[in-house]
């Protein structure tokens, strides 16, 4: 069971300082942006991180949403990352959910975050280059100190 608590507005960056945004095709991508670019591209660069109470505490449970015309929420259904047109629900009556991630602070690096799927233990949000695009994907952690699964989260509230 997950019960919604509070939400905050955040900018999410990879460790190369690229900013996460949602493009016109609703794809989550990373791109180099100045602070003014980041502001100019809002609300596509501003993510709503909603925290949830977890009946089986496994870390800080969150959903990641974005509000353009409508609210879309990040999902990792079948280990594929996509934004689904939905509000983060008030309650989720299950111990796993494709939209719930555990936001983990990397020990020794308070400002570096990982997002582990609640549906797929050991799978994390990651940034991966595919041709000329830097995509947000779900990835099994396969090497120690993998920088691609680490992010910084800057609160905009």
């Amino acid at each position: 069971y997950f019960g919604k608590l509070e939400s905050k507005l955040s900018v999410i960056r990879n460790l190369n300082d690229q900013v996460l945004f949602i493009d016109q095709g609703n794809r989550p991508l990373f791109e180099d942006m100045t602070d003014s670019d980041c502001r100019d591209n809002a609300p596509r660069t501003i993510f709503i991180i909603s925290m949830y109470k977890d009946s089986q505490p496994r870390g800080m449970a969150v959903t990641i949403s974005v509000k353009c015309e409508k609210i879309s929420t990040l999902s990792c259904e079948n280990k594929i990352i996509s934004f689904k047109e939905m509000n983060p629900p008030d309650n989720i009556k299950d111990t796993k959910s494709d939209i719930i991630f555990f936001q983990r602070s990397v020990p020794g690096h308070d400002n570096k975050m990982q997002f582990e799927s609640s549906s797929y233990e050991g799978y994390f949000l990651a940034c991966e280059k595919e041709r000329d695009l830097f995509k947000l994907i779900l990835k099994k952690e396969d090497e120690l100190g993998d920088r691609s699964i680490m992010f910084t989260v800057q609160n905009e509230d």
Epitope: E6, Q56, D110
Partner: antibody, heavy 119, light 110 residues
Framework: QVQLVQSGAEVKKPGSSVKVSCKAS????????ISWVRQAPGQGLEWMGN????????YYAQKFQGRVTITADESTSTAYMELSSLRSEDTAVYYC????????????WGQGTLVTVSS | QSVLTQPPSASGTPGQRVTISCSGS????????VNWYQQLPGTAPKLLIY???HRPSGVPDRFSGSKSGTSASLAISGLQSEDEADYYC???????????FGGGTKLTVL
């Protein structure tokens, strides 16, 4: 980097209660679990329970259920552990520990508080 | 009696490699993750290894962790005098809420 500073040593009589505090500074307090772990003289580590301040949820080890109460004050970034019905075998160093990765991965520790139970 | 079994003591000479074992069962290590803590004399424990084999920032790469079946081990290579300490293993449950520690191993650098 977060720092956890605990209250000073206590000497208590059997049957009484003790309340130990743990103040966090320099990091996020509310979102991450604060655990209490004790260590009797010359012995190993024993997890007592924890609290997640933002939710107020508490979890206690079965052994301490009913005798320990863990609370947190978000406004002062302070966690508290109260242990009642003290007996001599509760003489130990009591540590608070923050868990920012997972509620049971203790990545930052307080300096410890010695509680002596003696008549 | 601890749920996780560690040898009470271990020793080595400077530069040597030492391994500390931690034995459990399917209800703890067999199905869950393992952490290791180092406790220098008179100080609070410090996280050394988390999630079986991950090192927090600042922990030298001389320390490594591994897990196989219902046992885990901590290896320290290039032993140094400052490694003299007590070492504790801990197993934690991803989905439930319980944790157990080993009884600790006192490492002496000869």
């Amino acid at each position: 980097q977060v720092q956890l500073v605990q209250s000073g040593a206590e000497v208590k009589k059997p049957g009484s209660s003790v309340k130990v505090s743990c103040k966090a500074s320099g990091g996020t307090f509310s979102s991450y679990a604060i655990s209490w772990v004790r260590q009797a003289p010359g012995q190993g580590l024993e997890w007592m329970g924890n609290i997640i301040p933002i939710t107020g949820q508490t979890y206690y080890a079965q052994k301490f259920q009913g005798r320990v109460t863990i609370t947190a004050d978000e406004s002062t970034s302070t966690a508290y552990m109260e242990l009642s019905s003290l007996r001599s075998e509760d003489t130990a160093v009591y540590y608070c520990a923050r868990a920012a990765y997972h509620p049971l991965v203790f990545d930052n520790w307080g300096q410890g508080t010695l509680v002596t139970v003696s008549s | 009696q601890s749920v996780l079994t560690q040898p009470p003591s271990a020793s080595g000479t400077p530069g040597q490699r030492v391994t500390i074992s931690c034995s459990g069962s399917s209800s703890n290590i067999g199905n869950h993750y393992v952490n290791w803590y180092q406790q220098l004399p008179g100080t609070a424990p410090k996280l050394l290894i988390y999630r079986n084999n991950h090192r927090p920032s600042g922990v030298p790469d001389r320390f490594s962790g591994s897990k196989s079946g219902t046992s885990a081990s901590l290896a320290i290579s290039g032993l140094q005098s400052e490694d003299e300490a007590d070492y504790y293993c801990q197993s934690w449950d991803y989905s439930g809420f319980s944790t157990v520690f080993g009884g600790g191993t006192k490492l002496t650098v000869l």
